[in-house]
C-alpha cells in the first residue's frame, strides 16, 4: 500500500436546502483506471462511511445503498455533492481515495471538510 496526497476544502456551508458540495482532489502518481472514493463522517464519537463509489476513469460515479451522495469525476478531481443534510449532520466529512487498478494500490485520505448545516427557519404565517 502506497500513500497518496488528497486535498479537500477545510470548510463548506450547506445550502438552505441541505445540499453541500466540495471537490476532492488526489495527486495520482500513475495512470489509474479504477478508482474508489469513500466519504466518511467523523462526529459524535463515531465514524460513519457516508457513501462510496468505484468508477472507471472518465465514467460516472455510481453510489449504492440509497446514497445521499452524487458525484462526477474530471481527471484527478471528484466533485461530490451530499444532499438531505440537517443541522444534526454537521461534522467533519473526510474524502478517502483508493487507486484500485492497475497495481500498485494507492491510498489517500484527506484532512476533512467541516460541513456546517443550518436548518432553515420556518416561514412565519402570512395573511397573503
Amino acid at each position: 500500500c502506497k500513500a497518496m496526497h488528497v486535498a479537500q476544502p477545510a470548510v463548506v456551508l450547506a445550502s438552505s436546502r441541505g445540499i453541500a458540495s466540495f471537490v476532492c482532489e488526489y495527486a495520482s502518481p500513475g495512470k489509474a483506471t479504477e478508482v474508489r472514493v469513500t466519504v466518511l463522517r467523523q462526529a459524535d464519537s463515531q465514524v460513519t462511511e457516508v457513501c462510496a463509489a468505484t468508477y472507471m476513469m472518465g465514467n460516472e460515479l455510481t453510489f449504492l445503498d440509497d446514497s445521499i451522495c452524487t458525484g462526477t469525476s474530471s481527471g484527478n478531481q471528484v466533485n461530490l455533492t451530499i444532499q438531505g443534510l440537517r443541522a444534526m449532520d454537521t461534522g467533519l466529512y473526510i474524502c478517502k481515495v483508493e487507486l484500485m487498478y492497475p497495481p500498485p494500490y494507492y491510498l489517500g485520505i484527506g484532512n476533512g471538510t467541516q460541513i456546517y448545516v443550518i436548518d432553515p427557519e420556518p416561514c412565519p404565517d402570512s395573511d397573503f
Epitope: D44, T48, E49, L64, D65, D66, I68, L85
Partner: nanobody, 126 residues
Framework: EVQLVESGGGLVKAGDSLRLSCSAS????????MGWFRQAPGKEREFVAS????????SSADSVRGRFTISRDNAKNTVYLQMNSLKPEDTALYYC???????????????????WGQGTQVTVSS
C-alpha cells in the same frame, strides 16, 4: 415484521475474541441496514456498529474501532460482529436491530431501527 435472533455470546477473558451472529427471518433482509447495540447494567443502550444493506458501508463507535468488525451475508440473512481484544468494559447485553432504510447518516441512533432481537450476553472477565 422481522424476527431477529442473536447468538454467540458468552463468558470470556480480557483479550479474547467472540463472534456474534444475528439471523433474520421475515421481510427481505437485503433491503435494510443492520446494526449492533449494547446495554450494560444500569446504563443506556449504546451504538456499537452498523452496516449498509449491500454491506459496502459501515459505521462504528470510537470505543470499538479497530477491535470490532461488522459484516453481513445477505444470502444467509445473517449479520455478524467479530469482537477482538475484548475488555471488561465490553461486558453488556448485545442487541441486533434492523434499520428502516438501506443507509443513512443517523444509523447510530436507536430511533432509526424498527425491529430488535432479544439480545445475547457478553461477559468479559479481567
Amino acid at each position: 415484521e422481522v424476527q431477529l435472533v442473536e447468538s454467540g455470546g458468552g463468558l470470556v477473558k480480557a483479550g479474547d475474541s467472540l463472534r456474534l451472529s444475528c439471523s433474520a427471518s421475515g421481510r427481505t433482509f437485503a433491503n435494510n441496514a443492520m446494526g449492533w447495540f449494547r446495554q450494560a447494567p444500569g446504563k443506556e443502550r449504546e451504538f456499537v456498529a452498523s452496516i449498509s444493506a449491500s454491506g459496502t458501508l459501515t459505521s462504528s463507535a470510537d470505543s470499538v474501532r479497530g477491535r470490532f468488525t461488522i459484516s453481513r451475508d445477505n444470502a444467509k440473512n445473517t449479520v455478524y460482529l467479530q469482537m477482538n481484544s475484548l475488555k471488561p468494559e465490553d461486558t453488556a447485553l448485545y442487541y441486533c436491530a434492523r434499520n428502516r432504510r438501506a443507509w443513512s447518516l443517523s444509523v447510530h441512533t436507536t430511533r432509526e431501527y424498527d425491529d430488535w432481537g432479544q439480545g445475547t450476553q457478553v461477559t468479559v472477565s479481567s
